[in-house]
Interface confidence: medium
């Protein structure tokens, strides 16, 4: 059964864009006019999870690529990764838990909490050119993003 997908660009609250730096890593950096098209477009799928007034379960794929953000435990720490999937099977309504994020809207911003690891969020660093990672909202890490809709 086809599932609903919408396409977005994400920027953190410092207006850093997200780019694919090697096959399996996202980085956050400021882009200027001529290289603005380097930023990735996310395919957001509405998937199995527990929706509520303020949380919507979604999966985040990279448009045009068989890659999804997923959350796994590595060396005892919840970790964000880009995972390659079978394009014949994904996206699907019932994604494995590691692919599910609770999209939380806070005023005009949005946060993405791991469903597998509550209170861990897709995060960026204050510094430029650093990997996007899974953080527990501590210190100076950025967890608030803006979403720019992209026509399909």
């Amino acid at each position: 059964v086809p599932i609903r997908q919408l396409h977005y660009r994400l920027r953190d609250e410092q207006q850093k864009s997200l780019v694919l730096s090697d096959p399996y890593e996202l980085k956050a950096l400021h882009l200027n006019g001529q290289n603005i098209n380097q930023q990735v477009i996310f395919s957001m799928s509405f998937v199995q999870g527990e929706p509520s007034n303020d949380k919507i379960p979604v999966a985040l794929g990279l448009k045009g690529k068989n890659l999804y953000l997923s959350c796994v435990m590595k060396d005892g720490t919840p970790t964000l990764q880009l995972e390659s999937v079978d394009p014949k099977q994904y996206p699907k309504k019932k994604m494995e838990k590691r692919f599910v994020f609770n999209k939380i809207e806070v005023k005009s911003k949005v946060e993405f909490e791991s469903a597998e690891f509550p209170n861990w969020y897709i995060s960026t660093s204050q510094a430029e050119h650093k990997p996007v990672f899974l953080g527990n909202n501590s210190g100076q890490d950025i967890i608030d993003f803006t979403m720019e809709s992209v026509s399909s």
Epitope: V1, P2, Q48, G49, E50, P51, Q89, K92, K93, K94, E96, K97, R98
Partner: antibody, heavy 119, light 106 residues
Framework: QVQLQQWGAGLLKPSETLSLTCAVY????????WSWIRQPPGKGLEWIGE???????NYNPSLKSRVTISVDTSRNQFSLSLSSVTAADTAVYYC?????????????WGQGTLVTVSS | QSVLTQPPSVSVSPGQTASITCSGD??????AFWYQQKPGQSPVLVIY???KRPSGIPERFSGSNSGNTATLTISGTQALDEADYYC?????????FGGGTKLTVL
């Protein structure tokens, strides 16, 4: 309160086609998935398949070649057709709703219809 | 086809804790659900998304799911909890029920 009411022929001969319909009363039809499940006498539950309001379907691979699930959104109804039945298809057949608020699982069920296949 | 395995029967004394397991390959990667079915009745959802209770389901019902095993736990089991219990999950594009466990309250 949501209610699912189902009906259809209860006695079939081998090789005939089973046909059941489920009507949905209360609640939106388009916001959910609609499923069929069966349970042979004294045995466990078996998921048959599902459909959404647009007519997109998923089927159990073991039954896929014989099953058709269809939808009539104007009547808030969906139907099951199972061809070339044998005695092994004797079961109570349930219709059910899969809801996003319960993680896309089956939260409301019909009353069940016993279908017997016998020559 | 994917398989979810449950013990055929579990017995418990009133007031005690009953645990019903459901095992399947990498089941913890997916969400597990549990249904209660009493004789002659349609199944009723008692646990969804591993560990959440629908409204109207008593607090004594709880669930967990990790590794290859999902577990339904009924604490302070009552006579009215005697029923068949089915776990339920999905396998790629289709849904799978466990074989069912008959819970007997002695």
């Amino acid at each position: 309160q949501v209610q699912l009411q189902q009906w259809g022929a209860g006695l079939l001969k081998p090789s005939e086609t089973l046909s059941l319909t489920c009507a949905v009363y209360g609640g939106s039809f388009s916001d959910y998935y609609w499923s069929w499940i069966r349970q042979p006498p004294g045995k466990g539950l078996e998921w048959i398949g599902e459909i959404d309001h647009s007519g997109s379907t998923n089927y159990n691979p073991s039954l896929k070649s014989r099953v058709t699930i269809s939808v009539d959104t104007s009547r808030n109804q969906f139907s099951l057709s199972l061809s070339s039945v044998t005695a092994a298809d004797t079961a109570v057949y349930y219709c059910a709703r899969a809801s996003p608020s319960s993680g896309w699982t089956l939260d409301y069920w019909g009353q069940g219809t016993l279908v017997t296949v016998s020559s | 086809q994917s398989v979810l395995t449950q013990p055929p029967s579990v017995s418990v004394s009133p007031g005690q804790t009953a645990s019903i397991t459901c095992s399947g390959d990498k089941l913890g990667d997916k969400f597990a659900f549990w249904y209660q079915q009493k004789p002659g009745q349609s199944p009723v959802l008692v646990i969804y998304l591993d560990n959440k209770r629908p409204s109207g389901i008593p607090e004594r019902f709880s669930g967990s799911n990790s590794g290859n095993t999902a577990t339904l736990t009924i604490s302070g089991t009552q006579a009215l909890d005697e029923a068949d219990y089915y776990c339920y999950a999905w396998a790629d594009t289709y849904e799978v029920f466990g074989g069912g466990t008959k819970l007997t309250v002695l």
